[in-house]
Interface confidence: low
């Protein structure tokens, strides 16, 4: 027999199927031009010393073979003795290790068997009523197909599904959508209505995320506030990566889970923009304000569950950076300016009250004054910090107030509002004999002492009513008692106490009269 012809003789090996699991499979035969045909197959198992024979039986019952040698692809013409216009049955026999292995048979009409392509190019994936819808453009000159899909998850083998007949320029398929695991899909096509036509090879993998993106399991830490009034937010634990099926590992479009960071600055509510969304990989710098931070996971089907954390305000205070002067027209604050054209947000809140009661004011962009200070003034009528109580003040600055991540903390401090000099006057001043020439003076703590860093010192004044001599004694802000010594018996004295702040002298308490009785010896 000539090599180009199908040989109508017995093949050169005994006819005995070994029944082994290995062997030839996936036989496909097509017309590849007007007069040429090709059959190809796959061989599973060791290939050394294997010879392949393509067998063909005509409708008349006559059978022939082509010797392919070690190749798994063979071409022949319409002159090779195989009927191409009538139905034939083809299979492969592989002779190896003194035994024959046979492939499943394929029965077809060769002339009408066109090589079908799998879906090529892009496969558009969308969600439709809880299912996946895949859509692609029909390969050129191949309208009219049966389509199958197969799919698997990271933990399950391939499962086969049917897309049904297709007869349009675009083809589509409805497939199952998993809630919580990624899937890999592949599609294949074959000629519609052609008996025994071969399936195309499988398409490239289509990687589909779960309907619900995985909830991000992350932890944050926030650094100390730096000299520039900003602190770095850092990610302590990366989000867990989605487990992917085998064909989706590495470069897998479609299964991407995007994690975004949503910042909500709780402090300074009068600023223009309170929230900002960033990529999780780009960790921002924050001011010392309080924030809520949410991590939002999303995939091609939309957002999933998010996790929210609260980052408390940095409460480190600068006791001397803020200067406050109270005049007849109102109050002015001065603090070291940050830079040219800065917008400042001044926020104040009564100490010990709910965080929801914070009030704030936004300044117009301002340059430093000649002394390098920035200022903020308000009138008494405005009522700002007008009550005689302790306020916690924070000043934030930004050259771009519309950008949430560019705010920095200038300072945080305490301020006693209203008429601090009068309100801070110590009460309940009492005098007790201590010895023959000394007394102990006690008083109740000033209201200013409730305001950390505001009370600079107490001053106790003692006046000798005879000589009109006055002595003043400074007392630490943490003390509410002092011993006055060197007093003379029988002389009348008055004592007063006042509480001073760094910028205000206090009002003296009501004079308290006392004298040390003259001791008469027996």
């Amino acid at each position: 027999c000539r090599t180009s012809e199908c040989c109508f003789q017995d093949p050169p090996y005994p006819d005995a199927d070994s029944g082994s699991a290995s062997g030839p499979r996936d036989l496909r035969c097509y017309r590849i031009s007007s007069d040429r045909y090709e059959c190809s197959w796959q061989y599973e198992g060791p290939t050394a010393g294997v010879s392949h024979f393509l067998r063909c039986c005509l409708s008349s019952g006559r059978c022939c073979y082509f010797a392919a040698g070690s190749a798994t692809r063979l071409q022949f013409s319409d002159q090779a003795g195989v009927s191409v216009l009538y139905t034939v049955t083809l299979w492969v026999e592989s002779w190896a290790r003194n035994q024959t292995e046979k492939s499943p048979e394929v029965t077809l009409q060769l002339y009408n068997s066109v090589k079908y392509e799998p879906p090529l190019g892009d496969i558009k994936v969308s969600k439709l009523a809880g299912q996946l819808r895949m859509e692609w453009e029909t390969p050129d000159n191949q309208v009219g197909a049966e389509v199958q899909f197969r799919h698997r998850t990271p933990s399950s083998p391939w499962k086969l599904g049917d897309c049904g007949p297709q007869d349009d320029d675009t083809e589509s398929c409805l497939c199952p959508l998993e809630m919580n695991v990624a899937q890999e899909f592949q599609l294949r096509r074959r000629q519609l209505g052609s008996q025994g036509s071969s399936w195309s090879k499988w398409s490239s993998p289509v990687c589909v995320p779960p309907e619900n993106p995985p909830q991000p399991q992350v932890r944050f830490s926030v650094e100390q506030l730096g000299q520039d009034g900003r602190r770095r937010l850092t990610l302590k634990e990366q989000p867990t990566q989605l487990e992917l099926p085998e064909g989706c590992q590495g470069l897998a479009p479609g299964t991407e889970v995007t994690y975004r960071l949503q910042l909500h600055m709780l402090s300074c509510p009068c600023k223009a923009k309170a929230t900002r969304t960033l990529h999780l990989g780009k960790m921002p710098y924050l001011s010392g304000a309080a924030y809520n931070v949410a991590v939002i996971s999303s995939n091609q089907f939309g957002p999933g569950l998010n996790q929210t954390w609260h980052i408390p305000a940095d409460t480190h205070t600068e006791p001397v950076a803020l200067n406050i002067s109270v005049g007849t027209n109102g109050t002015t604050m001065y603090w070291p300016a940050r830079a040219q054209s800065m917008t400042y947000c001044i926020e104040w809140q009564p100490v010990g009250q709910d965080g929801g009661l914070a009030t704030c004011s936004l300044t117009a962009p301002q340059d430093p004054d000649p002394a390098g200070m920035a200022t903020y003034s308000w009138s008494r009528e405005s009522g700002a910090m007008g009550q005689e109580k302790c306020y916690y003040i924070t000043i934030f600055a930004s050259a771009h107030p519309e950008k949430l991540t560019l705010w920095s903390t200038v300072l945080s401090t305490y301020h006693f509002g209203g008429n601090a000099s009068a309100a801070g006057t110590p009460h309940h001043v009492s005098v007790k004999n201590h010895s023959l020439d000394s007394v102990s003076v006690d008083w109740a703590p000033s209201l200013l002492s409730t305001c950390p860093g505001v009370l600079k010192e107490y001053v106790v004044r003692c006046r000798d009513e005879d000589s009109k001599q006055v002595s003043e004694h400074p007392v630490q802000p943490t003390e509410t008692q002092v011993t006055l010594s060197g007093l003379r018996a029988g002389v009348a004295y008055t004592v007063q106490v006042r509480a001073d702040t760094a910028w205000l002298r206090g009002v003296w308490s009501q004079p308290q009269r006392f004298s040390i009785e003259v001791q008469v010896s027996d």
Epitope: L120, G121, D122, I123, K124, V125, E137, S203, S204, P205, C207, L251, A252, P253, G254, E256, Q300
Partner: nanobody
Framework: QVQLQESGGALVQPGGSLRLSCVVS????????IGWFRQAPGKEREGVSC????????IYSDSVKGRFTISRDNAKNTVYLQMNSLKPEDTGVYYC????????????????????WGKGTPVTVSS
Amino acid sequence: QVQLQESGGALVQPGGSLRLSCVVSGFTSDYFAIGWFRQAPGKEREGVSCIGSSDGSTIYSDSVKGRFTISRDNAKNTVYLQMNSLKPEDTGVYYCALDRGRRTIIGYACYATMKYWGKGTPVTVSS
């Protein structure tokens, strides 16, 4: 007849940069996915990066994310791969490949089953 011609491969020191070019000719469709693949000695060919024609969507393998950038110049029918911070493990033959596609979707079929391939350009990263 679709042809892809790569150029720009060279010997470069670790930490260095290279720019690969791929000129496409004979392809008329406006819609396609094009990408760079590489094959290290004794290893399988792997995807590096792909770009879609219609909207410029890009995708990168984990090993090159942040270091490599894919871009295209439609007027010149050229796709580029800018490779920065090169490492010895980036050594290999870099191939350009193209596949037909009509739509912008989640990602392009950036796999080694693309239809048209160039002959490759060698990149060696060594000190």
